[in-house]
């Protein structure tokens, strides 16, 4: 075929042409060149920059038998789903013997209806707290203007007119949805519906009442739940452990706490089945028929000693001459607290009762007035705590010590009148 | 608005010439590749010749091969298919016609045509 | 040379039909077939090109589709206006060619 300079000619028959649509398009881009010889490789260019991973194929078709006949090229280049970073100036580029040849330019642009970026999400708030719901949309074309819903019912006259990308909400005292619109010129789209539920705010002002050694009373002060009545509010109590470090705000305790339910009205707690001179930490929830409220902080509370339930075991009380030895053991019973010591009396049978702070130790040694001739002597011990005085053991005669002989020791006759105390763990 | 108008048919004798003229107005003429299409009598559609907006690169089918050429005058944005040693098979309606931007071999405007009569 | 076969020359069609016209390659044309159409008197006008892209002002009733060596060119709704002969071309490699046309005509 008769051809001019044609070097200097580009030998691109078929130039990239335009795509303009919605996001999720799939569209085609093709260059077709008609050269003499071997067939270049065609490169494809986005805005000047060669596309590595371009997803293209070439084709290739002699037009001839002979090696220097002419060769049609094609380059199709797919765009799978359109999406904005796919926008841009497209172009084709061959390397011709010393020459580069450049394709003229085709254009993918974006034009549909707004696109969002973000979007209102599910959440809880507390009843008559302000909070902030975000919404964020795109074209082109540009400009998007959003319009917020509340309960399907505008926030604005008109698009754009209200509150664009952050919609802050002074307070609800009902669950309620929220979405927004996003206008632009070819149309309208509507983000997800968000729900915002309403739960009751947090209680105030959990305080003790009272305080027993197994038992501690407590109240608070119940926070706005919106229009949905209160069910319910839930204390739960943990034993305090110097390792554990419960502060407000910190994650749970590892251990299980203990967990209570009150009835609302009134708010107020009698919490049993404590230790006795235990630090505790407590917090409360209340509920509605939307869910809970966020848990107060961790209030460390502590139950007060007691005194000891049982008396010391294993009294021996034996009689030399004018000295008398009695022995004991640490009550069985819980001490209630911590023992700051004992309490012995005797007595014998026509005088005044003797009584004596003996302390932590548990054996004494008394020397007995006179020749020793007080008949029916008899001798009672007592722990006792912070608190006060434990039971009183029961009566033990004093008895004369034989040598030879080992200590008579003496049972209790009597157990004490409320069986040793066992522990729920929880 | 794009247009084409071919001048230059008539009636002819076999082994005779022509030059037919393609005047266009409307584009930037010279962005463009340009192609001749004729029809027969029968309604036939047959491709005559392919130039490139440089004029550098032209293209005939191997029926025309050396008896027609094609050129063109940017400066004067004008077409020209000299046709000699022509035969009875060339009588046909002439088009010119313009090349899309994304296939030139596609042609996305037509002139309304001359007629050329090949016969004694 | 690349053959471009419009089996029909003729197809009747009733107002409002859908109808397709075919046109067969003779070998793979990487879908570059162009679709044209002549009403008496006129010179031919554009209305496809790369087998599916539509020329601008063309009526959206008229879609092109196919791949490989087979192409179609649908009108959804026949108008009246639409009464014409029907080309395919292949503008994938010189020499240019053509179909032998489809004339659409009413029932």
């Known amino acids: 075929a008769p051809r001019g300079t044609q070097a200097e000619e580009s030998p691109f028959v078929g130039n990239p042409g335009n795509i303009t649509g919605a996001r999720g398009l799939t569209g085609t881009l093709r260059c077709q060149l008609q050269v003499q010889g071997e067939p270049p490789e065609v490169h494809w260019l986005r805005d000047g920059q060669i596309l590595e991973l371009a997803d293209s194929t070439q084709t290739q078709v002699p037009l001839g038998e002979d090696e220097q006949d002419d060769w049609i090229v094609v380059s199709q280049l797919r765009i799978t789903s359109l999406q904005l970073s796919d926008t841009g100036q497209y172009q084709c580029l061959v390397f011709l013997g010393h020459q580069t040849f450049v394709s003229q330019p085709g254009y993918v642009g974006l034009e549909g209806l707004p696109y969002f970026l973000e979007e209102p999400e599910d959440r809880t708030v507390a009843a008559n707290t302000p909070f902030n719901l975000s919404c964020q949309a795109q074209g082109p074309p540009e400009p998007v203007d959003l319009l917020w819903l509340q309960d399907a019912v505008p926030l604005a006259t008109a698009p754009g007119h209200g509150p664009q990308r952050s919609l802050h909400v002074p307070g609800l005292n009902k669950t309620s949805s929220f979405s927004c619109e996003a206008h632009n010129a070819k149309g309208v789209t509507t983000s997800r519906t968000a729900t915002i539920t309403v739960l009751p705010q947090q209680p105030r002002n959990l305080h003790l009442v009272s305080r027993q050694p197994t038992e501690l009373e407590v109240a608070w002060t119940p926070g706005l739940s919106g229009i949905y009545p209160l069910t319910h509010c839930t204390l739960q109590a943990v034993l305090s452990d110097d390792g554990m470090g419960i502060q407000a705000g910190e994650p749970d305790p590892p251990e299980e706490p203990l967990t209570s339910q009150a009835s609302v009205p009134p708010h107020q707690l009698r919490l049993g089945s404590l230790h006795p001179h235990t630090p505790y930490h407590i917090r409360v929830a209340c509920t509605s028929s939307q869910g809970p409220s966020s848990w107060t902080h961790w209030l460390p509370v502590e139950t007060p000693e007691g005194v000891p339930l049982g008396p010391p075991e294993n009294i021996s009380a034996t009689r030399n001459g004018s000295q008398a030895f009695v022995h004991w053991q640490e009550p069985r019973a819980p001490l209630q607290g911590t023992l700051l010591g004992y309490r012995l009396a005797y007595q014998g049978q026509d005088t005044p009762e003797v009584l004596m702070d003996i302390g932590l130790r548990q054996e004494v040694t008394l020397e007995l007035q006179g020749d020793g001739s007080v008949s029916n002597l008899t001798v009672c011990v007592a722990a006792y705590t912070a608190a006060g005085d434990g039971p009183w053991s029961l009566p033990v005669p004093l008895e004369a010590w034989r040598p030879g002989q080992a200590q008579p020791v003496h049972q209790l006759v009597k157990e004490p009148s409320t069986p040793a105390f066992s522990w729920p763990w929880w | 608005e794009v247009k084409l108008v071919e001048s230059g048919g008539g009636l002819v004798q076999p082994g005779g010439s022509l030059k037919l003229s393609c005047a266009a107005s409307?584009?930037?003429?010279?962005?463009?590749?340009m192609s001749w299409v004729r029809q027969t009598p029968e309604k036939r559609l047959e491709w005559v010749a392919y130039?490139?907006?440089?004029?550098?690169?032209?293209y005939y089918p191997d029926t025309i091969k050396g008896r027609f050429t094609l050129s063109r005058d940017n400066d004067r944005n004008t077409l020209y298919l000299q046709m000699s040693s022509l035969k009875s098979e060339d009588t046909a309606m002439y088009y010119c016609a313009r090349g899309t931007t994304e296939s030139y071999y596609a042609l996305d405007y037509w002139g309304q045509g001359t007629s050329v009569t090949v016969s004694s | 040379d690349i053959v471009m076969t419009q089996s029909h020359k003729f197809m009747s069609t009733s107002l409002g039909d859908r109808i397709s016209i075919t046109c067969k390659a003779s070998?793979?044309?990487?879908?570059?077939v162009a679709w044209y159409q002549q009403k008496p008197g006129q010179s031919p006008k554009l209305l496809i090109y790369?087998?599916?892209t539509r020329h601008t002002g063309v009526p959206d009733r008229f879609t092109g589709s196919g791949s490989g060596t087979d192409y179609n060119l649908t009108i959804s709704s026949v108008q009246a206006e639409d009464l014409a002969l029907y080309y395919c071309?292949?503008?994938?490699?010189?020499?240019?060619?053509f179909g032998a046309g489809t004339k659409l005509e009413l029932k």
């Open positions: 409307g584009f930037t003429f010279n962005s463009y590749s």
């Open positions: 130039i490139s907006n440089g004029g550098g690169r032209t």
């Open positions: 790369w087998a599916s």
């Open positions: 071309q292949q503008h994938f490699s010189t020499p240019l060619t």
């Open positions: 070998q793979d044309v990487i879908t570059a």
